[in-house]
Interface confidence: low
Amino acid sequence: KKVVLGKKGDTVELTCTASQKKSIQFHWKNSNQIKILGNQGSFLTKGPSKLNDRADSRRSLWDQGNFPLIIKNLKIEDSDTYICEVEDQKEEVQLLVFGLTANSDTHLLQGQSLTLTLESPPGSSPSVQCRSPRGKNIQGGKTLSVSQLELQDSGTWTCTVLQNQKKVEFKIDIVVLAFQKASSIVYKKEGEQVEFSFPLAFTVEKLTGSGELWWQAERASSSKSWITFDLKNKEVSVKRVTQDPKLQMGKKLPLHLTLPQALPQYAGSGNLTLALEAKTGKLHQEVNLVVMRATQLQKNLTCEVWGPTSPKLMLSLKLENKEAKVSKREKAVWVLNPEAGMWQCLLSDSGQVLLESNIKVLPTWSTPVQP
């Protein structure tokens, strides 16, 4: 008996061939001997089966002795043994229809689980193997689960169903809803304008939801909501914003926030959350702000940074074009009785300068100038 695998929703063509290369009488029946279709001369006739409106044949092939049964919009319950009667012969074909669907939705938030469920006919014992867009293979039976989806899991998942040494392939497009970056850090001198950007790693036609930026300033004991906003069809509207600082927000995607000026009291970490309509859970992006200040008070030249710096970052004070006078893995460095000239405060990571602030030290009879 020939075995043919089909996919739910697809079309299958079951073949039946006579030895005579001409149009002769044929019938297709199911295992209950109910006639599905056949011919009466050059006319196609249909029986009382459930397939009635979904069954067809190709009259153009009858003259060559081919009498296919075409079943459109396959259903799992179409799985059956189909019998072609032609020239006093019976050809049996076993059709097994499978379906593979994603748990709820193919648009999932980063960190959520993807469950693929196989629908299969009774009596079958298929195995499934899926390959993710980043090349990860997973195997299973009736259900396959992938926990903690990552951004790289976005794309086409290819799943192969094996039964009776035959296979059928399913392709499922999965969109992982996430920000392009899980975390970002902005380095600014005191007083500079700060731009925070939160680009999304996906595109959808309509994007609706609401979001909020919570901020934990390094100097504050608790976090504070800096801004809340709504997103409607990719248009951003601010719902509320703190008085200090009063952030400004772009009206279009990507989400874009402007802090009028970087101040030590704002240095810290923020968490932007975005709740999308009809989705449980939220998208998150962490953003960090490091602020630098260089000051001269009487005979003391000081450079300080505030915010989440890593222990390997180096803070240095140096006179322009000279060796660093002081260089420490600390958040504040200073030089007593600095000589006149342009001093540079540098925050660097493995030799790469992340932030630089210049301060001009005048001879002792005048006051310092901040360029």
Epitope: K224, S225, T228, D230, S237, V238, K239, R240, V241, T242, Q243, D244, P245, K246, Q248, P260, Q261
Partner: antibody
């Protein structure tokens, strides 16, 4: 007492610009947003935008974007609203209005959009050729 | 933008009688986090700037007579003058301050019958 005093009436030609001032007194100028609202003759109220006198940050209604500029001078506690490329339909009374002060902040201390508790007396701007 | 629709456009009420003005917003102005309705009512007399009467939909501004009251939640709101006085003749506006652009209703003119 708390008040907003606006500059006097203006007559302008189409295509010109007008700059209306709003001087605040009786409260901490930098603490509360100043909004601008206009009212065409016999018509309703239309919000144009607002400025945070503390930071200078602005938020303009889409309709006026590109034509309106709101600025402030903290030394004189004055807010300015400049409207350019004037047309006859800009003929209106222009009001500055302060958003309600901190008594109406919510218990968590967050600042929300608020109602307007103090209004200037209004400045009539007539655009005519 | 949130559209504010007021009804009726004008209203004539006898002195001492009740006046009721309705205001409907095109979307809810109730913010669930603090359970507040971002709706205000203003009174404007001829030649004067508007005056704040009610904020948070039902809180009377200090100095406003208690014959003025606000009610409603979500999208439907009402301003009630329980006993109309001669000095209440004015145009009344509702305003949402839930989200920018802040928008006003078209106004309701209250007169004495």
């Amino acid at each position: 007492q708390v008040q907003l005093v606006q500059s006097g009436a203006e007559v302008k030609k189409p295509g010109a610009s007008v700059k209306v001032s709003c001087k605040a007194s009786g409260y901490t100028f930098t603490s509360y947003d100043i909004n601008w609202v206009r009212q065409a003759p016999g018509q309703g109220l239309e919000w144009m935008g607002r400025i945070n006198p503390g930071t200078g940050g602005t938020d303009y209604a889409h309709k006026f974007q590109g034509r309106v500029t709101m600025t402030r001078d903290t030394s004189t506690s004055t807010v300015y609203m400049e409207l350019s490329s004037l047309r006859s339909e800009d003929t209106a009374v222009y009001y500055c209005a302060r958003e309600t002060p901190s008594d109406y902040y919510d218990s968590s201390g967050y600042y929300y959009n608020d109602a307007f508790d103090i209004w200037g007396q209004g400045t009539t701007v007539t655009v005519s050729s | 933008d949130i559209v504010m629709t007021q009804s009726p456009d004008s209203l004539a009420v006898s002195l001492g009688e009740r006046a009721t003005i309705n205001c409907k917003s095109s979307q809810s102005v109730l913010y669930s986090s603090n359970n507040k309705n971002y709706l205000a009512w203003y009174q404007q007399k001829p030649g004067q700037p508007p005056k704040l009467l009610i904020y948070w939909a039902s809180t009377r501004e200090s100095g406003v007579p208690d014959r003025f009251s606000g009610s409603g939640s979500g999208t439907d709101f009402t301003l009630t003058i329980s006993s109309l006085q001669a000095e209440d003749v004015a145009v009344y506006y509702c305003q949402q301050y839930y989200s920018t652009p802040l928008t006003f209703g078209g106004g309701t003119k209250v007169e004495i019958k």
